[in-house]
Amino acid sequence: LNTTVLQGMAGQSLRVSCTYDALKHWGRRKAWCRQLGEEGPCQRVVSTHGVWLLAFLKKRNGSTVIADDTLAGTVTITLKNLQAGDAGLYQCQSLRGREAEVLQKVLVEVLEDPLDDQDAGDLWVPEESSSFEGAQVEHSTSRNQETSFPPTS
């Protein structure tokens, strides 16, 4: 499974979009988890609404928000007020009972804002318009890394 690398600026928002086959994953909740080490477990950060029909509603845990468009097959995770400690390897997961299937692996990199200790003046940009939309927005940086992943069957 490929790992998507996303870069975000400290203090701003990073938006991750994980796409999936909506019919294949029918009825499954989605989750965003943080990988603890190379082979370690993936620690749940936030998951979608317990009632699948309400998965479109935003669920928040701290500064992380998740929402799922189950018809379009896109789960969106927003990491607000990005901090250096948010950098690391994450997973978008599809849940069925106790099973968690990896939809996408995401490596989050946090860039220090060069204007952090200076007067930004007219260069200040509202948070919403400076969010990163996965690999789909021009001013975000993303690349793919080939990583091995054991077969599911």
Partner: antibody, heavy 122, light 107 residues
Framework: EVQLVQSGAEVKKPGESLKISCKGS????????IGWVRQMPGKGLEWMGI????????RYSPSFQGQVTISADKSISTAYLQWSSLKASDTAMYYC???????????????WGQGTMVTVSS | EIVLTQSPATLSLSPGERATLSCRAS??????LAWYQQKPGQAPRLLIY???NRATGIPARFSGSGSGTDFTLTISSLEPEDFAVYYC?????????FGGGTKVEIK
């Protein structure tokens, strides 16, 4: 009409290989999971495994992992169940079934094949 | 894997009587439970999904209830064609296991 049509009955000897089929029609074959269910003579239903023909993602029940292989050819809307070396204990009726989607997010086997009787005897 | 236990194994009743079949899960399956009917020489047929929703074309005399670990299939007034074997199945997590079945026979 939405239906699943299975291949005919088979009589085999122990150690032989076998591949039975299940052809879907009347719906988008690639968009529904297809499951296989075993029913030994006079016994209940056993969930063997399941495949999503769209990408051939497959799941097996622990009891059947390594014993059978489930596959699909989406170009001809057909799912398969195969054995490399049959045993007498494989004698059973085998059903394929479509995992239908319900509005609430649940799924259930809503369309069933007619079954394929496999007899393994020396 | 989740184990489903059905009881009783056999239910002997007369036409017109009420049948109550039980299915118990080894752990919670929420409401992700279905019921199937199988007659001799036939493939199973979906009766109930989501524990309580009747499948298309299923008569109103069939009803399901329960959530978590305890479920019930009720046939309010048995018709001659209802004498068959009934199976519960969970679709909460892989593998989607079946119960052992309850045979409803004519008394």
């Amino acid at each position: 009409e939405v239906q699943l049509v299975q291949s005919g009955a088979e009589v085999k000897k122990p150690g032989e290989s076998l591949k039975i089929s299940c052809k879907g029609s009347g719906y988008s074959f690639t968009s529904y999971w297809i499951g296989w269910v075993r029913q030994m003579p006079g016994k209940g239903l056993e969930w063997m495994g399941i495949i999503y023909p769209g990408d051939s993602d497959t799941r097996y029940s622990p009891s059947f992992q390594g014993q059978v292989t489930i596959s699909a050819d989406k170009s001809i809307s057909t799912a398969y169940l195969q054995w490399s070396s049959l045993k007498a204990s494989d004698t059973a009726m085998y059903y394929c079934a479509r995992l239908g989607r319900k509005p609430s997010g649940s799924v259930a086997f809503d369309i069933w094949g007619q079954g394929t009787m496999v007899t393994v005897s020396s | 894997e989740i184990v489903l236990t059905q009881s009783p194994a056999t239910l002997s009743l007369s036409p017109g009587e009420r049948a109550t079949l039980s299915c118990r899960a080894s752990q919670s399956v929420s409401s992700y439970l279905a019921w199937y009917q199988q007659k001799p020489g036939q493939a199973p047929r979906l009766l109930i999904y989501d524990a309580s929703n009747r499948a298309t074309g299923i008569p109103a005399r069939f009803s399901g209830s329960g959530s978590g670990t305890d479920f019930t299939l009720t046939i309010s007034s048995l018709e001659p064609e209802d004498f068959a074997v009934y199976y519960c199945q969970q679709d909460y997590s892989w593998p989607y296991t079946f119960g052992g079945g309850t045979k409803v026979e004519i008394k």
